[in-house]
Interface confidence: medium
């Protein structure tokens, strides 16, 4: 008799999920000498232990603590780049500017980037058919709780000037409900962080508006200021030129505002 399986609204676990996590871990630890001590089999066991046999709507940050411990990593606290709704450009930037780091440049972020996973209560099976959707099903699902946990820790580690890349093409440039707006902003430590500098990335070719005056950016400024952190905002009018100038800052076309 086929066992009844809960149908969730979101896509199921990414195919070959265990193999993918393990392979990513091996690759990361080979590339990053400071993480060579990490035992990837133990990392996978801890990752698996966080959600296997547990109800996928009842996951807690506590479930991920063994994984967090194994993935403990020190990145330069003054070189952190946060992002919201503009992941690709943020990653392109840190690939060129190798001394700055997004969450996905850390081991734990790298392992989970773009993956989905969940299990089932009381069975050791991974659910490849469907997983809970944050809105339609539940917020305490394995993927959401993972990103909330690692994002909080990443923000807590930040110091000095923290940069955040925001998508100027969206109706809410700063969205209080995004991971940045709901987790990272509130976990920056005022005793360590002097300034949050927002880079608002323009989408349109001829868009010369000052998006730093957008009401949602003013809302971000207000939240940050109330936390005794200074706020700064810059428009990046030409993201293509921005990347080009990061690659080659001495280029004559990079002497003007980007």
């Amino acid at each position: 008799v086929p066992r009844w399986r809960q149908q969730w609204s979101g896509p199921g676990t990414t195919k070959r999920f265990p193999e993918t996590v393990l392979a990513r871990c091996v690759k990361y630890t080979e590339i990053h000498p400071e993480m060579r001590h990490v035992d990837c089999q133990s990392v996978w066991d801890a990752f698996k232990g966080a959600f296997i046999s547990k109800h996928p709507c009842n996951i807690t940050e506590e479930d991920y603590q063994p994984l967090m411990k194994l993935g403990t990593q020190t990145v330069p606290c003054n070189k952190i780049l946060l992002w919201s709704r503009i992941k690709d450009l943020a990653h392109q930037f840190t690939q060129v500017q190798r001394d700055m780091f997004t969450l996905e440049d850390t081991l734990l972020g790298y392992l989970a980037d773009d993956l989905t996973w969940c299990g089932e209560f009381n069975t050791s099976k991974i659910n490849y058919q469907s997983c809970p959707d944050w809105r339609k099903d539940c917020s305490n699902n394995p993927v959401s709780v993972f990103w909330k946990t690692v994002s909080r820790r990443f923000a807590e580690a930040a110091c000095d000037v923290v940069h955040v890349m925001l998508n100027g093409s969206r109706s809410k440039i700063f969205d209080k409900n995004s991971t940045f707006g709901s987790v990272e902003v509130h976990n920056l430590q005022p005793e360590k962080v002097q300034t949050l500098e927002a880079w608002v990335i323009h989408g349109g070719r001829e868009d010369s508006r000052d998006l730093c005056q957008d009401p949602t950016i003013k809302e971000l400024e207000s939240i940050i200021s109330k936390r005794n952190i200074q706020f700064s905002c810059k428009n990046i009018y030409r993201p293509d030129k921005f990347l080009q100038c990061v690659k080659n800052p001495e280029d004559s076309s990079c002497t003007s505002e980007i």
Epitope: D160, V246, P249
Partner: nanobody, 123 residues
Framework: DVQLVESGGGLVQAGDSLRLSCAAS????????MAWFRQAPGKEREIVSS?????????YADSVKGRFTISKDSAKMNTVYLQMNSLEPEDTAVYYC???????????????WGQGTQVTVSS
């Protein structure tokens, strides 16, 4: 790490000139973008001028444009200068040298700071 030591400050009359120097030791310095900041009593620290890694790009605050010139020592590349002409009482401040590992106008991020040198301009 990089250590920065400023010199050349002092007391001058309005209209006079001063040349500040910032000498760096430690890691290879030629790969650093540099800047001069200043902080007047009771005011926030502000950027005065910046220069890119090779010295090819320079930037100035509006208040000093045409009067101040930033440069890097082309031979050693481990010293950056701020030539200050036509000094005004409003230029009175502690001047700080700063360095960072990459140059982009958008960023406030400077990794290394000197202790500062006092510049006083009397009227």
């Amino acid at each position: 790490d990089v250590q920065l030591v400023e010199s050349g400050g002092g007391l001058v009359q309005a209209g006079d000139s001063l040349r500040l120097s910032c000498a760096a030791s430690g890691r290879t310095f030629s790969s650093y973008a540099m800047a001069w900041f200043r902080q007047a009593p009771g005011k926030e620290r502000e950027i005065v001028s910046s220069i890119s890694t090779s010295g090819g790009i320079t930037d100035y605050a509006d208040s000093v444009k045409g009067r101040f010139t930033i440069s890097k020592d082309s031979a050693k590349m481990n010293t950056v200068y701020l030539q200050m002409n036509s000094l005004e009482p409003e230029d009175t401040a502690v001047y700080y040298c700063a360095a960072r590992t990459w140059y982009l106008r958008t960023s406030l991020q400077y990794d290394y700071w000197g202790q500062g040198t006092q510049v006083t301009v009397s009227s």
